[in-house]
């Protein structure tokens, strides 16, 4: 359905943060869900050396944070 040459056109508004208020980024499904639906990761057995399970779920941080910054402990804000 695409036709013709392409041109670059950016959006004027600043980039939105990944999740709207009251939603958090779900590491299992890799998109934003209602924060109340987040499941907590299973506790890691003592001495276990495997990485944290993929079911670990975290609130989202704002877009644009630099490398090394921790995820903010609150839902994403627009």
């Amino acid at each position: 359905m695409r036709r013709g040459p392409r041109s670059l056109r950016g959006r004027d508004a600043p980039a939105p943060t990944p999740c709207v208020p009251a939603e958090c980024f779900d590491l299992l499904v890799r998109h934003c869900v209602a924060c109340g639906l987040l499941r907590t990761p299973r506790p890691k057995p003592a001495g276990a050396s495997s990485p944290a399970p993929r079911t670990a779920l975290q609130p989202q941080e704002s877009v644009g944070a630099g490398a090394g910054e921790a995820a903010l402990p609150l839902p994403g804000l627009l």
Partner: antibody, heavy 118, light 107 residues
Framework: QVSLKESGPGILQPSQTLSLTCSFS??????????GGWVRQPSGKGLEWLAH???????YYNPALKSRLTISKDTSKNQVFLQIANVDTADTATYYC??????????WGQGTSVTVSS | DIQMTQSPSSLSASLGERVSLTCRAS??????LNWLQQEPDGTIKRLIY???RLDSGVPKRFSGSRSGSDYSLTISSLESEDFVDYYC?????????FGGGTKLEIK
């Protein structure tokens, strides 16, 4: 402001490997919850998702093409790469990169045209 | 894979008319659906995310809704720049899948 731009070879021959680069600005792929992905569109047809990669190196591929696809990123250079091995004329398309965040693709590049021809 | 069936594939309408495009999901995708607009030069822009949320800068004549497995994009009053192509995208699960597209043409 978020912007993305794709680059590629333009034309290549069957059986060769297609290498695409997405250069972006306005966000970082080191940020929690950020990803970059690739979508293609043959002329006059619809969109087909190919692959994406997350800030934590987690990768997802289109199952129908998985054996030929390799996605990677260079966080320090703000780039995402896609390789498609053993291309055929069916791989002729416009290839788009897009930022992926909490609600899938939100910003798209302009697209780069790739023709596979002998 | 989740199949997204988009209808109609093409639609002729007049300026000022109200139109609706529909995507039907083959499996439950919750609210994980976006609507994209593609201009003739290939430029792609997201209009609606999470079924019904309007992206910043998108005119309020665009709206999204859901009824069961059917997802709709409605344009309340068509303007000249709206006569382009539209796609739905589900991101509930990988692989992400698109609808086949709707070409909106001026009558």
């Amino acid at each position: 402001q978020v912007s993305l731009k794709e680059s590629g070879p333009g034309i290549l021959q069957p059986s060769q490997t297609l290498s695409l680069t997405c250069s972006f600005s306005g966000f970082s792929l080191s940020t929690f919850g950020m990803g970059g992905g690739w979508v293609r569109q043959p002329s006059g047809k619809g969109l087909e998702w190919l692959a994406h990669i997350w800030w934590d190196e987690d990768k997802y591929y289109n199952p129908a093409l998985k054996s030929r696809l390799t996605i990677s990123k260079d966080t320090s250079k703000n780039q995402v790469f896609l390789q498609i091995a053993n291309v055929d004329t069916a791989d002729t398309a416009t290839y788009y990169c897009a930022r992926i965040a909490g609600y899938a693709m939100d910003y798209w590049g302009q697209g780069t045209s790739v023709t596979v021809s002998s | 894979d989740i199949q997204m069936t988009q209808s109609p594939s093409s639609l002729s309408a007049s300026l000022g008319e109200r139109v609706s495009l529909t995507c039907r999901a083959s499996q439950d995708i919750g609210s994980n659906l976006n609507w994209l607009q593609q201009e003739p030069d290939g430029t792609i822009k997201r209009l609606i995310y999470a079924t019904s949320r309007l992206d910043s800068g998108v005119p309020k004549r665009f709206s999204g809704s859901r009824s069961g497995s059917d997802y709709s994009l409605t344009i309340s009053s068509l303007e000249s720049e709206d006569f382009v192509d539209y796609y739905c995208l589900q991101y509930a699960s990988s692989p992400y899948t698109f609808g086949g597209g709707t070409k909106l043409e001026i009558k």
